[in-house]
Interface confidence: medium
C-alpha cells in the first residue's frame, strides 16, 4: 500500500526517495512518474535521471536535493488539487529484474483561510521496519526502509532547510531508501 504525504494548494510538495550510490558519482538511473509503478520504467514520466544528470523533466517538477549523492526526492512546485494521486519513484538498479519501486501517495488539501502561526514539523515518530535482501550483480546488499506517514503542511517554508537540517537526516532515515553496494 502507498504511504501518504500531504501538502496544501499553492505550496511545494515533497516526496522522499533515496538510494546510496555504490561509489561517489556511480549513479543509478531513476525515474519519477504520475501513477503507480508499472511493470517497466515509470508511466507518465515527470522527471528522469541517467548515470550522469537529470535528462528529462517537466515544469514544476524538480530535484531539490543532491541527486549525485542519491537524494532523488521529488519536489512539485505550487501544487493544485489535480496533483493529488500516486507517484512512482523507480530506482533502476543494474541486474536482472533488480529495480526498486516505491509508490507514494500525495494528498493535496485546500489552502487554509488563515496562515498557520507556526511551522508544522510533526513527523510520524515511528522508525521504519528494515529489510535486508540479497541483490543481483552490483547490488550486493539492499536495505529498504518502509515509508512513514509524513505530514508536511508547510513544505514550501521548509524546502530550503531540509537540505542542511537534522530534519533532512530524519527523512533520509525514514524515507524510501535503498543502499547499493
Amino acid at each position: 500500500s502507498e504511504v501518504e504525504y500531504r501538502a496544501e494548494v499553492g505550496q511545494n510538495a515533497y516526496l522522499p526517495c533515496f538510494y546510496t550510490p555504490a561509489a561517489p558519482g556511480n549513479l543509478v538511473p531513476v525515474c519519477w512518474g504520475k501513477g503507480a509503478c508499472p511493470v517497466f520504467e515509470c508511466g507518465n514520466v515527470v522527471l528522469r535521471t541517467d548515470e550522469r544528470d537529470v535528462n528529462y523533466w517537466t515544469s514544476r517538477y524538480w530535484l531539490n536535493g543532491d541527486f549525485r549523492k542519491g537524494d532523488v526526492s521529488l519536489t512539485i512546485e505550487n501544487v493544485t488539487l489535480a496533483d493529488s494521486g500516486i507517484y512512482c519513484c523507480r530506482i533502476q538498479i543494474p541486474g536482472i529484474m533488480n529495480d526498486e519501486k516505491f509508490n507514494l501517495k500525495l494528498v493535496i488539501k485546500p489552502a487554509k483561510v488563515t496562515p498557520a502561526p507556526t511551522r508544522q514539523r510533526d513527523f510520524t515518530a515511528a522508525f521504519p521496519r528494515m529489510l535486508t535482501t540479497r541483490g543481483h550483480g552490483p547490488a550486493e546488499t539492499q536495505t529498504l526502509g518502509s515509508l512513514p506517514d509524513i505530514n508536511l503542511t508547510q513544505i514550501s517554508t521548509l524546502a530550503n532547510e531540509l537540505r542542511d537540517s537534522r530534519l533532512a537526516n530524519d527523512l533520509r532515515d525514514s524515507g524510501a531508501t535503498i543502499r547499493i553496494g
Epitope: 501513477g35 508499472p38 520504467e41 508511466g43 541517467d50
Partner: antibody, heavy 119, light 110 residues
Framework: QVQLVQSGGGLVQPGGSLRLSCAAS????????MSWVRQAPGKGLEWVSA????????YYADSVKGRFTISRDNSKNTLLLQMNSLRVEDTAVYYC????????????WGQGTMVTVSS | NFMLTQPPSASGTPGQRVTISCSGS????????VNWYQQLPGTAPKLLIY???QRPSGVPARFSGSKSGTSASLAISGLQSEQEADYYC???????????FGTGTKVTVL
C-alpha cells in the same frame, strides 16, 4: 522523426536460427521498455518478449522461453531478438514496439518483418 | 498462450455506435491497465487507447475506453468505413508475467 526500422527476417529451416534487429531513432532509446510482438498469417497479435530500458529486466512468452533471447544495445539504439531452435509455429510477422507507458502501451511500431520457418 | 476474450466480430451502419468487450481475470484486467489497438489490413497495429481510457494525441474522440472489474470495453461512435479493422485489447498479466492480447474483433461497416 520517431521511428523503428526492422531488419533480419527471412526463410529458415526448423531448428535453425535467426536474429531480428530493430533500429530506433528520434527518441531517447534507453528511456523506454521495448517489446517484440508477432502475428502468424491470418491470426491475432501475440506478445513475444519485453526488455526494460536499461536491459536489466526481461520477460518472455511461455511459447518462446528458452529459445528466444531479447537484448538491446543502448549505445547503438538497437533492439535485438535472437531466435534459436525455430519451429514451424514461429512463422509470423514480427514487430518491435516501444512501450511508452510501462504497462504495454505500444505507441510506436516497426514496419514488421516476416519470419518463415519451413523445410 | 493465454488470451483475453473478445467477440470475433462486430458491425454497424455508418454513424452508429459499436462497442467491443474484452474479458479477462483478476491477474490481468483486474490488476492492470488496459490498452486497445487498431490494425488496418496489411499494416502494423496502432495504439488507440492506453491506461483504460486515455487517447494518444491524434486519436479522434470517437474512440473511448472503459474498464470495470475484470472486463473492459472499447466504444466507437460515429462509425465510418475507415474504421473497418481488427481491434485488440491487451493487458499485463501478473500471474504469467506476460503481456496478453485479446483474441481480436473484426469490425465491419455495413
Amino acid at each position: 522523426q520517431v521511428q523503428l526500422v526492422q531488419s533480419g527476417g527471412g526463410l529458415v529451416q526448423p531448428g535453425g536460427s535467426l536474429r531480428l534487429s530493430c533500429a530506433a531513432s528520434g527518441f531517447t532509446f534507453s528511456s523506454y521498455a521495448m517489446s517484440w510482438v508477432r502475428q502468424a498469417p491470418g491470426k491475432g497479435l501475440e506478445w513475444v518478449s519485453a526488455i526494460s530500458g536499461s536491459g536489466g529486466s526481461t520477460y518472455y512468452a511461455d511459447s518462446v522461453k528458452g529459445r528466444f533471447t531479447i537484448s538491446r544495445d543502448n549505445s547503438k539504439n538497437t533492439l535485438l531478438l535472437q531466435m534459436n531452435s525455430l519451429r514451424v509455429e514461429d512463422t509470423a510477422v514480427y514487430y518491435c514496439a516501444r512501450d511508452f507507458s510501462g504497462w504495454g502501451g505500444f505507441d510506436i511500431w516497426g514496419q514488421g518483418t516476416m519470419v518463415t520457418v519451413s523445410s | 498462450n493465454f488470451m483475453l476474450t473478445q467477440p470475433p466480430s462486430a458491425s454497424g451502419t455508418p454513424g452508429q455506435r459499436v462497442t467491443i468487450s474484452c474479458s479477462g481475470s483478476s491477474s490481468n484486467i483486474g490488476s492492470n491497465t488496459v490498452n486497445w489497438y487498431q490494425q488496418l489490413p496489411g499494416t502494423a497495429p496502432k495504439l488507440l487507447i492506453y491506461s483504460n481510457n486515455q487517447r494518444p494525441s491524434g486519436v479522434p474522440a470517437r474512440f473511448s475506453g472503459s474498464k470495470s472489474g475484470t472486463s473492459a470495453s472499447l466504444a466507437i461512435s460515429g462509425l465510418q468505413s475507415e474504421q473497418e479493422a481488427d481491434y485488440y485489447c491487451a493487458a499485463w498479466d501478473d500471474s504469467l508475467n506476460n503481456y496478453v492480447f485479446g483474441t481480436g474483433t473484426k469490425v465491419t461497416v455495413l
